[in-house]
């Protein structure tokens, strides 16, 4: 049994989160991705994914994600960037591989964004916005819907939750009331 | 709790190989990346190679790059790194430490094997 | 090859007063940077990670703030148990993951 962990990053507004996420790249190099927020009592919602199949080091945007996979590293790079308060919560890398439950990859991570400015003198943490340029070709891709065959009135597992896992992802089979994705034609 | 601890080193000469190994426990082993890290007697950090999660990638400091070989057993929560054609300037302490889950930092070290390459 | 630059090597400081240690980068890496606390015969630890996130467990007088290039470790009142060498890293994407050369906290 594997325990679902979680990372934290506190981070002011206006800061970029920049997380990468490690999958087996034999397995899932052209796999979808997508990057989901968990809130308590629903389902894992896509905020973002990368088209299908996957293309490399390609970017993809949607709002303020940045999404690049990174099919000879294993590597989905996972970038949000003028980050709000709203924005604070759980989130997830996950692999789309229909008709199969989607894999989830370690770890969770759970973001607090705070107000105010946490800068120091010289440091450039005021030009969020100017390190982190979005290239001029970036795609947004459709993601697939998740439905559920009934209401969720329960969180999904918590950090202690123990489900299977295949190599080095979580395989959600064991919870597939909280999760389902259509099968693609 | 997650512990790592690192065995398998000693005094040996230049040109000569030695196997260094990593027991890990207290988490997902296959989940995370893990990496070596060494530090020469009064010197600082460097790192050495990085291994993912499933074993299908590695890197290498360009220094050990085609001498040293690192690998994982998942089903025995070990990693081990195979040092070929050793060279004084390779002595050192090695530190088997856990990537992260999410970046590349390392968020748990053992206490590290000295490495001694002298004639 | 991203180079980390620390400054200063050596910083003397009385116990009880603020500590500020500087890493450079010498390219954007963003908030991809690590801080790693080290005691003589002793494994490294992990202090900040992201610029600005502390670890578990780690006091909250440690603080660490920059993005970009320009780094800043903070020990806001020192204690006994913080006189050490303290290394900063940089983790923008894949390997080489470089470390800076080490500032040494003394007592002052």
């Known amino acids: 049994a594997t325990k679902l962990t979680e990372e934290k990053y506190e981070l002011k507004e206006g800061q970029t989160l920049d997380v990468k996420c490690d999958y087996t790249l034999e397995k899932f190099a052209s796999s979808q991705k997508a990057w989901q927020i968990i809130r308590d009592g629903e389902m894992p919602k896509t905020l973002a994914c990368t088209e299908r199949p996957s293309k490399n080091s390609h970017p993809v945007q949607v709002g303020r994600i940045i999404l690049e996979d990174y099919h000879d590293h294993g590597l989905l790079r996972v970038r949000m960037v003028n980050l709000q308060v709203e924005d604070s919560g759980l989130y997830q890398c996950v692999i789309y591989q229909p008709p199969k439950e989607p894999h989830m990859l370690f770890d969770r991570i759970r973001l607090v964004v705070t107000k105010g400015f946490s800068g120091t003198p010289g440091s450039n943490e005021n030009s969020t916005q100017n390190v982190y340029k979005i290239p001029p070709t970036t795609t947004k891709a459709l993601c697939p819907l998740y439905t559920s065959p009934r209401t969720v009135t329960q969180a999904p597992p918590k950090s202690t939750a123990d489900v299977s896992t295949p190599d080095s992802e979580i395989n959600l089979t064991n919870v597939t009331d909280i999760i389902r994705v259509p099968v693609f034609n | 709790e997650v512990q790592v601890l690192e065995s398998g080193g000693g005094l040996v000469q230049p040109g000569g190989s030695l196997r260094l190994s990593c027991a890990a426990s207290?988490?997902?082993?296959?989940?995370?990346?893990m990496s070596w890290v060494r530090q020469a007697p009064g010197k600082g950090l460097e790192w050495v190679s990085t291994?993912?999660?499933?074993?299908?990638?590695?890197y290498y400091a360009d220094s050990v790059k085609g001498r040293f070989t690192i690998s994982r057993d998942n089903s025995k929560n070990t990693l081990d790194l195979q040092m070929n054609s050793l060279r004084a300037a390779d002595t050192a302490v090695y530190y088997c430490?856990?990537?992260?889950?999410?970046?590349?930092?390392?968020?748990?070290w053992g206490q590290g094997t000295l490495v001694t390459v002298s004639s | 090859e991203i180079v980390m630059t620390q400054s200063p090597a050596t910083l003397s400081v009385s116990p009880g007063e603020r500590a500020t240690l500087s890493c450079r980068a010498s390219?954007?890496?963003?908030?991809?940077l690590a801080w790693y606390q080290q005691k003589p015969g002793q494994a490294p630890r992990l202090l900040i990670y992201?610029?600005?996130t502390r670890a578990t467990g780690i006091p909250d007088r440690f603080s660490g703030s920059g993005s970009g290039t320009e780094f800043t470790l903070t020990i806001s009142s020192l204690q006994s148990e913080d006189f050490a060498v303290y290394y900063c890293?940089?983790?923008?994407?894949?390997?080489?993951?470089?470390f800076g050369q080490g500032t040494k906290v003394e007592i002052k």
């Open positions: 430490a856990k990537v992260a889950g999410s970046n590349f930092f390392f968020d748990h």
């Open positions: 207290g988490f997902t082993f296959n989940a995370y990346a």
């Open positions: 291994i993912s999660g499933s074993g299908s990638t590695t």
């Open positions: 390219q954007s890496i963003n908030s991809n």
């Open positions: 992201g610029a600005y």
């Open positions: 890293q940089e983790f923008i994407m894949w390997p080489p993951y470089t």
